[in-house]
């Protein structure tokens, strides 16, 4: 018995070869002897039943001259798994067809952190092994059900599942979309008074995107968090539902989600959490955003530089006179210089020598007031 493996919805070719390598009479039948199709000597394909019943069955007329009389079954169904008989030159050849199906649980669009379950459906009597490879090259294998918990962004893409049965294999490709923001977290560094831009690009594209979202903000100076903005998303169009009066945020109506804050102020420095609930999906997408604000001031004989917001302890805050060595440099959120000499002073927030934020302040001779460029 020859074994042929097929995939549900696709086509399978069941072989039947003549020893004479020329056109001859042949008939394909089901195991219960019902006729499917054949050729009775006139080079014409004759079907065994009504067209609607047998429209999925065909042969390759171009191969007949070479002594090959395959049975082509299109749009395979699980119930096509059975034995087929090819009658040719007073002999019968049995071909066993096993149709397999691999499906993803409920949906192929899953939120980051959710689980993916791949299920193999196989015909009775078969004992296949299955191995699936993720887009990032991770292999998982098991029985009829394979599970991956805590899906990550890198799991988006084509999963390849190989079903092995009697040394024969059939490959399934399943496109999985992990719904997530491109970045889990981002940090924005701004001088006091500058405009602030927050962008929340999605890591996936879908034809129609509908849902609702909200940005909650925990200011460093505040005891509790506050909702800054709520919005709806319909077919990729953003419409603001409610926005706080302070700060007065602006939000773009096109994707990617984009917000602007008219100016960076110490009272806004802190952390935000943007959540997006998508229609027909359980759970929400999250992106954290952080705002660090710098202010340089001179009050009488004291030049001060301060930062507000979530800074790492390894960040260095420095005050230096332009083109000179730093006068003061500390792993703190405020530094100052008493009786600063006249000139352009720079306040720098840096991480391992890389400047993240810079604010300049001009110190005039003692009889004048300072100028902030």
């Amino acid at each position: 018995k020859t074994l042929v493996l097929g995939k549900e919805g696709e086509s399978a070719e069941l072989p039947c070869e003549s020893s004479q390598k020329k056109i001859t009479v042949f008939t394909w039948k089901f195991s219960d002897q019902r006729k499917i199709l054949g050729q009775h000597g006139k080079g014409v394909l004759i079907r065994g039943g009504s067209p609607s019943q047998f429209d999925r069955f065909d042969s390759k007329k171009g191969a007949w001259e070479k002594g090959s009389f395959p049975l082509i079954i299109n749009k395979l169904k699980m119930e096509d798994s059975q034995t087929y008989i090819c009658e040719l030159e007073n002999r019968k050849e049995e071909v066993e067809l096993w149709v397999f199906k691999v499906t993803a649980n409920s949906d192929t669009h899953l939120l980051q952190g959710q689980s993916l379950t791949l299920t193999l459906e196989s015909p009775p009597g078969s004992s296949p092994s299955v191995q699936c490879r993720s887009p990032r090259g991770k292999n998982i294998q098991g029985g009829k059900t394979l599970s991956v918990s805590q899906l990550e962004l890198q799991d988006s893409g084509t999963w390849t599942c190989t079903v092995l049965q009697n040394q024969k294999k059939v490959e399934f490709k399943i496109d999985i979309v992990v719904l997530a923001f491109q970045k889990a977290s981002s940090i924005v560094y701004k001088k006091e008074g500058e405009q602030v831009e927050f962008s929340f690009p999605l890591a996936f594209t879908v034809e129609k995107l509908t849902g609702s979202g909200e940005l909650w903000w925990q200011a460093e100076r505040a005891s509790s968090s506050k909702s800054w903005i709520t919005f709806d998303l319909k077919n990729k169009e953003v419409s603001v539902k409610r926005v706080t009066q302070d700060p007065k945020l602006q939000m773009g109506k096109k994707l990617p989600l984009h917000l602007t804050l008219p100016q960076a102020l110490p009272q806004y420095a802190g952390s935000g959490n943007l959540t997006l609930a998508l229609e027909a999906k359980t759970g929400k997408l999250h992106q954290e955003v952080n705002l660090v604000v710098m202010r340089a001031t001179q009050l009488q004989k004291n030049l001060t530089c301060e930062v507000w917001g979530p800074t790492s302890p390894k960040l260095m805050l420095s005050l230096k006179l332009e083109n000179k060595e730093a006068k003061v440099s500390k792993r703190e959120k405020a530094v100052w210089v008493l009786n600063p000499e006249a000139g352009m002073w720079q306040c720098l927030l840096s991480d391992s020598g890389q400047v993240l934020l810079e604010s300049n302040i001009k110190v005039l001779p003692t009889w004048s007031t300072p100028v902030q460029p």
């Epitope: 405009q195 831009e197 709806d232 077919n235 169009e237 602006q250 773009g252 096109k254 602007t260």
Partner: antibody
Framework: EVQLLESGGGLVQPGGSLRLSCAAS????????MSWVRQAPGKGLEWVSG????????YYADSVKGRFIISRDISKNTLYLEMNSLRAEDTAVYYC????????????WGQGTLVTVSS | AIQMTQSPSSLSASVGDRVTITCRAS??????LGWYQQKPGKAPKLLIY???SLQSGVPSRFSGSGSGTDFTLTISSLQPEDFATYYC?????????FGQGTKLEIK
């Protein structure tokens, strides 16, 4: 071919009402965002009101909020602007404009209809 | 609402000149900006969308640039038919707002 044809303009007294219509053809009206833009004599362009194609949300300039109502009749492929409590400063040519598919500007405009508010 | 400040308000130039018009937004608007040309008694015409994309059928002498808050419309070599009034429009969010316009006249 895309066509936008405004009608309904005319002379109206201050405090009066008027309804402008814009008959649209040549594109999928039901899914397109549409707007009304006006131009007072000798002045610049002013965006007045818009309606979203995807969700039917309506939007207004502060100068007309509470007095004007934008709406659409998808079965008739027609956009409307209901103008109430009209003032002299509402005197302008009113244009109906179609937004590009992905909301990047107005790619088609009507010829405009003149609304004059005067006693 | 987002304010759009367009400059200059008027400009005199000659055929063949290179002309630049600028527009500044009061808020960051990404590249959500269009440029329009209007001739007397006519409806406006879209020239540039998404700050730098040329609308179909518009001559390549028109170009747009910029992102964030500062935008520019450039006409590389003025043609007689280019003398008109030009407007920028932010379509970042509602309410949309136009710049005050730049009247381009023959010197």
């Amino acid at each position: 071919e895309v066509q936008l044809l405004e009608s309904g303009g005319g002379l109206v007294q201050p405090g009066g009402s008027l309804r402008l219509s814009c008959a649209a053809s040549g594109f999928t009206f039901s899914t397109n965002a549409m707007s009304w833009v006006r131009q007072a004599p000798g002045k610049g362009l002013e965006w007045v009101s818009g309606i979203s194609g995807s969700n039917g949300n309506t939007y207004y300039a502060d100068s007309v909020k509470g007095r004007f109502i934008i709406s659409r009749d998808i079965s008739k492929n027609t956009l409307y602007l209901e103008m109430n409590s009209l003032r002299a400063e509402d005197t302008a040519v009113y244009y109906c404009a179609k937004e590009r598919d992905n909301w990047n500007g107005f790619d088609y405009w009507g010829q405009g209809t003149l609304v004059t508010v005067s006693s | 609402a987002i304010q759009m400040t367009q400059s200059p308000s008027s400009l005199s130039a000659s055929v063949g000149d290179r002309v630049t018009i600028t527009c500044r937004a009061s808020h960051v608007i990404r590249n959500d900006l269009g440029w329009y040309q209007q001739k007397p008694g006519k409806a406006p015409k879209l020239l540039i969308y998404a700050a730098s994309s040329l609308q179909s059928g518009v001559p390549s002498r028109f170009s747009g640039s910029g992102s964030g808050t500062d935008f520019t419309l450039t006409i590389s070599s003025l043609q007689p038919e280019d003398f008109a009034t030009y407007y920028c429009l932010q379509d970042y969010n509602y309410p949309y707002t136009f710049g005050q316009g730049t009247k381009l006249e023959i010197k």
